[in-house]
């Protein structure tokens, strides 16, 4: 057998499909690892071989296309299954190879079952709607390539267990779910179970996501620092701990990146030489807005440290602010026997 | 100042339509959602209809679906309110709150009654 | 669609007195649930929000509590003017519903 580049396991490309459904899965080589198409090696006299492991097995076997109704069969650079069964689950190879190439990649394929509710152990992809806007949709996804366009199949969707019908503000529209003023109530997982017929058979597809209603960019800001503030004085003694928290919060902004940092006299704290510790917490509203806190630390603070500038600073897509605290020397409180009485003129 | 002057009311016919307005001030009415409370005489108070601040989004009671419209004008900050095939059931005074989804009706008009008989 | 229940539909209190009112839910609204003071030929102003936070301007007698679907508002020493109508409002699932209403009067 000559040398063949192997792509290994795939395991970025995790399978996931239901039990007793259909599923087509196209050879990840095509999508991810050649710079060429299917149809284009197809030409050039390249033969795309299917195998697969069977869980829990170590031998390559491989894929029965004889089977009743052509329960498996392969169209080009797809792997049909017209229905899936429980003991498909597996590692799959796709090779492309002729006289003088080979390229090859494995992927696991895990077919899953669902209760009638629609649970299952498939990682949901998550779909983020903002609070309050007008009409948003979202739409049945991965139903694609399996039935033409002549055949009209029939939608029927759910919020977790239950129909939608009646839903005051969410309104199904064949392959799309309307959501009009989203509410947090609104969030949840949503099914499409799309019917169709082929070949004197009828074919379900089961598509669930999670809807999550997150805050809206109309309503965003820039950061806001809580503290530190212009209230609040930290006065300290030499030789005593210096806590000082840095609070933002951040106004949920889609793919945006918030930062939270301190600078000491101008400087990050790890470009300067005190021994200086930051604790960091991370919470979320209901809307994914988030609120991040840095609480700078100085175990035994110098009169030096308490002459430095210490400032928060904070970034979103939305802008940068900065607030310094307000940080000072605690005046020691005088001793009566010495101080005071000098102060009334005793000798 | 938040200020909803509400406009339009009046007696109209079993089956007639009417149109209300509400004219919003002191703040930037483009970014509130807005609805149409009603309270017939003596009673409590009902949610009729709801638009997202873009006007995109509207809602409605199943009492009023089909015959009531809500729309809103960001460039004259005005809500509206068209009612068509008007029932004696519909009598009642007419209110426009603003609302967010965090804080609910925050801020009323003064009403516009709507008296149907014939 | 949910509704809202309130209790008791009046409520006789001397000025002084501390009032509770009661709204419950026919299922759960989390803490999307508000309270209104209407007066006679008024407007509805809001109180409460959230359950429990006081809007702005209200004065602190009045408070709110609960979650799910038990509320209740409390007004801690009525004055005068705290003799009104009261409503409490789900706003967790459209429709927003409103209760029926608790009348609070002079005893």
């Known amino acids: 057998s000559e040398r063949c580049d192997d792509w290994g396991l795939d395991t970025m490309r995790q399978i996931q499909v239901f039990e007793d459904e259909p599923a087509r899965i196209k050879c990840p080589l095509f999508e991810h690892f050649l710079k060429f198409n299917y149809s284009t090696a197809h030409s050039a006299g390249l033969t795309l071989i299917w195998y697969w492991t069977r869980q829990d097995r170590d031998l390559e076997e491989p894929i029965n296309f004889r089977l009743p109704e052509n329960r498996i069969s392969k169209e080009k650079d797809v792997l049909w299954f017209r229905p899936t069964l429980l003991n498909d689950t597996g590692n799959y190879t796709c090779m492309l190879r002729n006289t003088t190439y080979c390229s090859k990649v494995a992927f696991p394929l895990e077919v899953v079952q669902k209760d009638s509710c629609f649970n299952s152990p498939m990682k949901l992809p998550v779909h983020k709607l903002y609070i309050e806007y007008g009409i948003q949709r979202i739409t049945c996804p991965n139903v694609d390539g399996y039935f033409p366009s002549s055949v009209k199949p029939t939608i029927t969707w759910y919020m977790g267990c239950y129909k939608i019908q009646n839903f005051n503000n969410v309104i199904p529209e064949g392959m799309n779910l309307s959501f009009l003023i989203a509410l947090i109530s609104n969030n949840g997982n949503y099914t499409c179970v799309v019917t169709y017929p082929e070949n004197g058979r009828t074919f379900h597809l089961t598509r669930t996501l999670t809807v999550k209603v997150v805050g809206s960019p109309k309503n965003a800001v820039p950061p806001v620092i809580h503290s530190p503030n212009d209230h609040v004085v930290y006065e300290k003694e030499p030789g005593e701990e210096l806590l000082i928290p840095c609070t933002v919060y951040f106004s949920f902004l889609m793919d945006s990146r918030n930062e939270v940092w301190w600078t000491i006299d101008g400087k990050k704290p790890d470009d300067i030489t005190i021994d200086v510790t930051i604790n960091e917490s991370i919470s979320h509203s209901r809307t994914e807005d988030e609120t991040r806190t840095q609480i700078l630390s100085i175990k035994k603070v110098t009169s030096e440290d308490l002459k430095r500038s210490y400032v928060c600073h904070a970034r979103s897509a939305k802008g940068e602010v900065a607030k310094a605290a307000k940080v000072k020397q605690k005046v020691p409180a005088p001793r009566y026997t010495v101080e005071l009485a000098c102060g009334f003129g005793a000798t | 100042e938040v200020q909803l002057l509400e406009s339009g009311g009046g007696l109209v016919q079993p089956g007639g339509s009417l149109r209300l307005s509400c004219a919003a001030s002191?703040?930037?009415?483009?970014?509130?959602?807005m609805s149409w409370v009603r309270q017939a005489p003596g009673k409590g108070l009902e949610w009729v209809s709801a638009?997202?601040?873009?006007?995109?989004?509207?809602l409605y009671a199943d009492s009023v679906k089909g015959r009531f419209t809500i729309s809103r004008d960001n460039s004259k900050n005005t809500l509206y309110l068209q009612m068509n095939s008007l029932r004696a059931e519909d009598t009642a005074v007419y209110y426009c709150?603003?609302?967010?989804?965090?804080?609910?009706?925050?801020?009323w008009g003064q009403g516009t009654l709507v008296t149907v008989s014939s | 669609e949910i509704v809202m229940t309130q209790s008791p539909a009046t409520l006789s209190v001397s000025p002084g007195e501390r009032a509770t009112l009661s709204c419950r839910a026919s299922?759960?609204?989390?803490?999307?649930l508000a309270w209104y003071q209407q007066k006679p030929g008024q407007a509805p102003r809001l109180l409460i929000y959230?359950?429990?936070t006081r809007a702005t301007g209200i004065p602190a007698r009045f408070s709110g509590s609960g979650s799910g679907t038990e509320f209740t508002l409390t007004i801690s020493s009525l004055q005068s003017e705290d003799f009104a109508v009261y409503y409490c409002?789900?706003?967790?699932?459209?429709?927003?519903?409103f209760g029926q209403g608790t009348k609070v009067e002079i005893k």
């Open positions: 709150a603003r609302f967010r989804y965090y804080t609910a009706f925050d801020y």
């Open positions: 002191g703040f930037t009415f483009s970014h509130y959602g």
């Open positions: 638009i997202s601040y873009d006007g995109e989004g509207t």
């Open positions: 299922q759960s609204v989390s803490s999307n």
């Open positions: 959230g359950a429990s």
């Open positions: 409002q789900q706003y967790n699932n459209w429709p927003w519903t």
